[in-house]
């Protein structure tokens, strides 16, 4: 069971300092941006991280949404990352959900975060280069200290 607590507006970056944004095709991509670029591209660079109380605290249960014309929420249905047009619900009566991720910190580095899927244990949000694009994907954690599954989350409010 997950019960919604509060939401924060955040900028999410990979460890190469590239900013996560939603492109015109609703794809989550990372790109080099200055702070002014980041502001100019809002709201596509501003994510609503909603925190949920979890009956079993395994990390901070969160949804990640964005509000352009409408609110879309990140989903990892069938291990494929996409934004679905929906508001983060107030309650989820299950222990797993395609839109719930466990946000966890890295010891000694409070600003470094990982996001594990609640539906697919051991699968994490990651940044992966595909041709010229840096994409947000769901990836099975495989190697020691994998930097691609680590992000910084900067609260904007």
């Amino acid at each position: 069971y997950f019960g919604k607590l509060e939401s924060k507006l955040s900028v999410i970056r990979n460890l190469n300092d590239q900013v996560l944004f939603i492109d015109q095709g609703n794809r989550p991509l990372f790109e080099d941006m200055t702070d002014s670029d980041c502001r100019d591209n809002a709201p596509r660079t501003i994510f609503i991280i909603s925190m949920y109380k979890d009956s079993q605290p395994r990390g901070m249960a969160v949804t990640i949404s964005v509000k352009c014309e409408k609110i879309s929420t990140l989903s990892c249905e069938n291990k494929i990352i996409s934004f679905k047009e929906m508001n983060p619900p107030d309650n989820i009566k299950d222990t797993k959900s395609d839109i719930i991720f466990f946000q966890r910190s890295v010891p000694g580095h409070d600003n470094k975060m990982q996001f594990e899927s609640s539906s697919y244990e051991g699968y994490f949000l990651a940044c992966e280069k595909e041709r010229d694009l840096f994409k947000l994907i769901l990836k099975k954690e495989d190697e020691l200290g994998d930097r691609s599954i680590m992000f910084t989350v900067q609260n904007e409010d």
Partner: antibody, heavy 120, light 107 residues
Framework: QVQLVQSGAEVKKPGSSVKVSCKAS????????ISWVRQAPGQGLEWMGG????????NYAQKFQGRVTITADESTSTAYMELSSLRSEDTAVYYC?????????????WGQGTLVTVSS | DIQMTQSPSSLSASVGDRVTITCRAS??????LNWYQQKPGKAPKLLIY???TLQSGVPSRFSGSGSGTDFTLTISSLQPEDFATYYC?????????FGQGTKVEIK
């Protein structure tokens, strides 16, 4: 740098209660867990329970359920552990430990420990 | 509850020795295991998390391996400051538990 400072040593009588405090500084308090871990003389580490202040409710190890109460005051960034119905085997060093964001999956900062002696 | 069994409970070794400590979980915990070092009168110190990731500031002579139920902490070349007690901790479920500890003493 995160720092956890605990209250001083206590001597208690069997059957009484003890309340130990743990004041956090230098980091985010509300969304990171605070756990209590005890260590009896010459023994190992025992997780008693913990709290994530933003959640409000605490989680307890089965062994201590009903006898321990863990609370947190976000306004002062202080966590508390109260153990009731004390017996001699509760004589131990009690540590508070800061855990991960929203959970108990590691403990990277520890308090200095509080010795609680239960003796008649 | 998941039980954690460490072996040996104590060992004697010399400076420069390679030391191995094992930790066995009563059920599979994936890589959700941490290792701590504790010196007398001091609080524990996190050495390794998620089975094999070295905590920042910890010397590289410490390493962790294993997944599922069997895990190992290795000190490749024991140094005088490494004589201490070592604990494993599982966090597969939020009810976390520690192993009983392994004391590393000077031979």
């Amino acid at each position: 740098q995160v720092q956890l400072v605990q209250s001083g040593a206590e001597v208690k009588k069997p059957g009484s209660s003890v309340k130990v405090s743990c004041k956090a500084s230098g980091g985010t308090f509300s969304t990171f867990s605070i756990s209590w871990v005890r260590q009896a003389p010459g023994q190992g580490l025992e997780w008693m329970g913990g709290i994530i202040p933003i959640f409000g409710t605490a989680n307890y190890a089965q062994k201590f359920q009903g006898r321990v109460t863990i609370t947190a005051d976000e306004s002062t960034s202080t966590a508390y552990m109260e153990l009731s119905s004390l017996r001699s085997e509760d004589t131990a060093v009690y540590y508070c430990a800061r855990g991960g964001y929203g959970g108990y999956y590691y403990f990277d900062y520890w308090g200095q420990g509080t010795l609680v002696t239960v003796s008649s | 509850d998941i039980q954690m069994t460490q072996s040996p409970s104590s060992l004697s070794a010399s400076v420069g020795d390679r030391v191995t400590i094992t930790c066995r979980a009563s059920q599979s915990i994936s890589n959700r295991l941490n290792w701590y070092q504790q010196k007398p009168g001091k609080a524990p110190k996190l050495l390794i998390y998620k089975g094999s990731t070295l905590q920042s500031g910890v010397p590289s002579r410490f390493s962790g391996s294993g997944s599922g139920t069997d895990f190992t902490l290795t000190i490749s070349s024991l140094q005088p400051e490494d004589f201490a007690t070592y604990y494993c901790q599982q966090h597969k479920v939020w009810l976390t538990t520690f192993g009983q500890g392994t004391k590393v003493e000077i031979k």
